[in-house]
Structures are given as C-alpha cells and as structure tokens.
C-alpha cells in the first residue's frame, strides 16, 4: 500500500510534471510566438485511455517528436532550451510509471494539435493530483 | 509588478564558494522561469544557470560541474550554489524571473550582485 510520503513524493512530481508542461503550452500560445501555425501543422498521438500513471508511457513515446516541434522556435535566446524542459520531463515520467511493468499504449484513431496533445496531458496531471489530496 | 532581490555576493579567494539568493514578491505566476546571468566589465551579459518552476534546470558550460541551481517555489525564491570559483567568474550577478522559456521575453530583472573572485 502506498505511504503518505510515496504520495506526497508523487504528488510533487506531478505538480512538477504539470508546470513544464504548462509552461511549453504558454510559450507556444504566447501570441508573439511567429512559428505558431507552423507548429499547428504537426500531429501528435493522443492516449486511448489515460487516468493511471502507467498510462504515461503514451507521453513518453512522444517526447522526441514534442521535442522536435519545440526547436522550431529555433531561438537562440532560450533560458531553458526545449531539450531542458523535456529532459526533466522525461525524468519525472520515468519515475511515475515505473520501470517494473511494461505497458503497452494505445492511441487514439484520431491525432492532435500540440496544443491539444499539452492540454491532454495537463488535464491528466490535473486530475490524478485531485485523486492524491 | 515582480520586485527581485539579490543577496549573497561578496568578495572570494579562488577556489571558494558563495550562494546566492533571489527571492521574487509582487504579481507572481506560478509557471516561470528565474535564472542567473552575469555581466563581467566590457563584456555581454550572459546565462550562468536558469530553471523552471517545474525544476528543468540549464546552465552554461563553463559553469556545468562547479554551480548549482535550486528553487523553494514556495518562497518564491531561486539559489546559485557556485563552488570552485575561479577570477573569470567575477562579474555582477542578475536574477531573472520570466514566464516564458525565451530569453527575449524576460519579465523583470534584478538590481544585480557583485561576485569578487581574488586572492
């Protein structure tokens, strides 16, 4: 059975998950953001299903292309470059899911905008952080 | 309005350390980015180490090994553990905070810190 501080532990590296991938999402909808409809036009693979924390391997599976699109900005003024951001976010899914079982994703028939796809991903972070307070 | 407000520099023998700190108040979001970058005399202003509040870190090489970046996003306040300090480290050091992970929309910067590296 989980302890409280395997849950406190969880819930911090969701809420860290969560504001990475907030913050990729406000960079992107930023309205100066001139490569915006070029991102648009890349398609993502969105979850099946996604309400347990195995379920992130369906995010893991699409860091590199998230990656990709990121260095579309292509500015050479970065605090953190997108391959920070998703490095640290690569960690944290590893550390969610675990390495224990393997689990298979399946996706969706229909793909997604980048937007959609963070969003998706944001509501998940979301909504298992309520189930752990 | 976001104030920022440095502390922790000083003058240092080579080979030291000093930790920095910048604590943010104002109009804080929840999603930033704070950061440190430094500015020696007749020179740029350059990327020592910056870090997202979701705990993405990046740090410029010279610096990769030496320096440390941490945050209390609680205290909204950001650290720059430097260690094994060297002369070419002594520039003023700014904080950063910004809501984008661009550099070219940094929010607000602090009044800086002076870092002394000497014997």
């Known amino acids: 059975a989980p302890t409280s501080s395997s849950t406190k532990k969880t819930q911090l590296q969701l809420e860290h998950l969560l504001l990475d991938l907030q913050m990729i999402l406000n960079g992107i909808n930023n309205y100066k953001n001139p490569k915006l409809t070029r991102m648009l036009t890349f398609k993502f693979y969105m979850p099946k299903k996604a309400t347990e924390l195995k379920h992130l391997q369906c995010l893991e599976e699409e860091l590199k292309p998230l990656e990709e699109v990121l260095n579309l900005a292509q500015s050479k003024n970065f605090h953190l470059r997108p391959r920070d951001l998703i490095s640290n976010i690569n960690v944290i899914v590893l550390e969610l899911k675990g390495s224990e079982t393997t689990f298979m994703c399946e996706y969706a028939d229909e793909t997604a905008t980048i937007v959609e796809f963070l969003n998706r991903w944001i509501t998940f972070c979301q909504s298992i952080i309520s189930t752990l307070t | 309005e976001v104030q920022l407000v440095e502390s922790g520099g000083g003058l240092v023998q080579p080979g030291g350390s000093l930790r920095l700190s910048c604590a943010a108040s104002?109009?804080?979001?929840?999603?930033?980015?704070m950061g440190w970058y430094r500015q020696a005399p007749g020179k740029g202003r350059e990327l020592v180490a910056a870090?997202?509040?979701?705990?993405?870190?990046n740090y410029a090489d010279s610096v990769k090994g030496r320096f440390t970046i941490s945050r209390d996003n609680a205290k909204n306040t950001v650290y720059l553990q430097m260690n094994s300090l060297k002369p070419e480290d002594t520039a003023v050091y700014y904080c950063a905070y910004a809501s984008s992970f661009y550099e070219d929309e940094t929010d607000y910067w602090g009044q800086g810190t002076q870092v002394t590296v000497s014997s």
């Open positions: 104002g109009s804080i979001f929840s999603i930033n980015v």
């Open positions: 870090i997202s509040s979701g705990g993405s870190t």
